[in-house]
Interface confidence: medium
């Protein structure tokens, strides 16, 4: 399992992971105490047939070619959590591991 | 976590799971001894903002709106394995659980 890593200078058109810092302060999300920003990353690019396909299923659907099935799209295939300190709806301070906040790898599925 | 289920008569345009039987025999994939066919399902449909989003990350990327980030796409969010009997490259018969062969749920990511 592998995926491409790119940056803003890359000429890669295929599915790739790009750096992205999410800034909660800039969004005005004041209920998030910490972190105020974090490296989230994102996926972008084209999914040519078979390139970076995560699942055999993707290939099989392409073979079967059912009505309305779009080609695979560039999407996170591995994600990781971050620890966050935030206010919940009852204004209690919560410290917890929030799943799937960081994209570690992108692929076509 | 939930996802929509549709069939060929559905008028649903949003991201949905559709039935699909993959027939290895029809593909001529005779190195697969069994099963000869199985219910794989597939995902299709539109991902309006926030509808069926699997990860908070998807929402955050939409907020940050980086260069080249496409909107979320309709993709498997839960998959399950099937047991398969097949020949490997050395013509040995292998029996094993092959991951991510069946789409159990679709969502936008």
């Amino acid at each position: 399992d592998f995926g491409l890593d790119c940056d803003e200078h890359s000429t890669e058109s295929r599915c790739c992971r790009y750096p992205l810092t999410v800034d909660f302060e800039a969004f005005g999300w004041d209920w998030i105490i910490a972190p105020k920003r974090y490296k989230a990353n994102y996926c972008s690019g084209e999914c040519e047939f078979v390139f970076l396909q995560k699942y055999p299923h993707t290939h099989l659907v392409h073979q079967a070619n059912p009505r309305g099935s779009a080609g695979p799209c560039c999407t996170p295939t591995k994600m990781s959590p971050i620890n966050m300190l935030y206010f919940n709806g009852k204004e209690q301070i919560i410290y917890g591991k929030i799943p799937a906040m960081v994209v570690d790898r992108c692929g076509c599925s | 976590d939930f996802g929509l289920d549709c069939d060929e008569h559905s008028t649903e345009s949003r991201c949905c799971r559709y039935p699909l039987t993959v027939d290895f025999e029809a593909f001529g994939w005779d190195w697969i001894i069994a099963p000869k066919r199985y219910k794989a399902n597939y995902c299709s449909g539109e991902c309006e903002f926030v509808f069926l989003q699997k990860y908070p990350h998807t929402h955050l990327v939409h907020q940050a709106n980086p260069r080249g980030s496409a909107g979320p796409c309709c993709t498997p969010t839960k998959m399950s394995p099937i047991n398969m009997l097949y020949f490997n490259g050395k013509e040995q018969i292998i029996y094993g659980k092959i991951p991510a062969m069946v789409v159990d749920r679709c969502g936008c990511s």
Epitope: - | F24, E25, D30, W31, I32, I33, A34, P35, K36, N83, L85, F87, E91, I93, Y95
Partner: antibody, heavy 124, light 107 residues
Framework: QVQLVQSGAEVKKPGASVKVSCKAS????????MHWVRQAPGQGLEWMGN????????NYNQRFKARVTMTTDTSTSTAYMELRSLRSDDTAVYYC?????????????????WGQGTLVTVSS | DIQMTQSPSSLSASVGDRVTITCKAS??????LSWFQQKPGKAPKSLIY???RLVDGVPSKFSGSGSGTDYTLTISSLQPEDFATYYC?????????FGQGTKLEIK
């Protein structure tokens, strides 16, 4: 429907070879194991071996390994069983049988179709 | 090789009777046992697979049971067409081996 049609009866002399054919129809021949089973007159059934037509991979009963060869011709959907160095105790009806996979385990099979049998008589 | 011992080797019964045939393996065969019916001059016909599963189209008067090394075939109410020879087969490992057969005759 699945049909297995075998070649006609043969009379052979001791030491000779015999090649029995089994023509399959009604299914995708290459994707199913074909087995060979024999039955001496008034006796029980004896498994000889199998072959997977897609790639020719075969398993033989050790008892016959030195004398038997199983082959297939995918262009005609035909399986063959050749037995060499025939002896009088090889006189038997030889059956081909398709093995169907029904389940989820590594040995989940049964014989769902049989040929009509080919009588091979070995006599001097 | 796994030895399959079938008993009895022959059995006389009347129409309407319930009969049981047993098959004993020389080692655990993990329920990978099939039963066949054979009539004179004909190819065998599959009845039961995986010890207790009925092949499509086979009447429910045939049933199989057992596990480990001991297995049975039961015919609940004999009809004239059921008089034949019955064989068990183990498919847990190669070589596949059959029992020696049980000839079911009309009393």
């Amino acid at each position: 429907q699945v049909q297995l049609v075998q070649s006609g009866a043969e009379v052979k002399k001791p030491g000779a070879s015999v090649k029995v054919s089994c023509k399959a129809s009604g299914y995708s021949f290459t994707g199913y194991f074909m087995h060979w089973v024999r039955q001496a007159p008034g006796q029980g059934l004896e498994w000889m071996g199998n072959i997977y037509p897609y790639n020719g991979v075969s398993n033989y009963n050790q008892r016959f390994k030195a004398r038997v060869t199983m082959t297939t011709d995918t262009s005609t959907s035909t399986a063959y069983m050749e037995l060499r160095s025939l002896r009088s105790d090889d006189t038997a009806v030889y059956y081909c049988a398709r093995r169907y996979y029904y389940g989820t385990g590594p040995a989940d099979w049964y014989f769902d179709s049989w040929g009509q049998g080919t009588l091979v008589t070995v006599s001097s | 090789d796994i030895q399959m011992t079938q008993s009895p080797s022959s059995l006389s019964a009347s129409v309407g009777d319930r009969v049981t045939i047993t098959c004993k393996a020389s080692q655990d065969i993990n329920s990978y046992l099939s039963w066949f019916q054979q009539k004179p001059g004909k190819a065998p016909k599959s009845l039961i697979y995986r010890a207790n599963r009925l092949v499509d189209g086979v009447p429910s008067k045939f049933s199989g049971s057992g596990s480990g090394t001991d297995y049975t075939l039961t015919i609940s109410s004999l009809q004239p067409e059921d008089f034949a020879t019955y064989y068990c087969l183990q498919s847990d490992e190669f070589p596949l081996t059959f029992g020696q057969g049980t000839k079911l005759e009309i009393k």
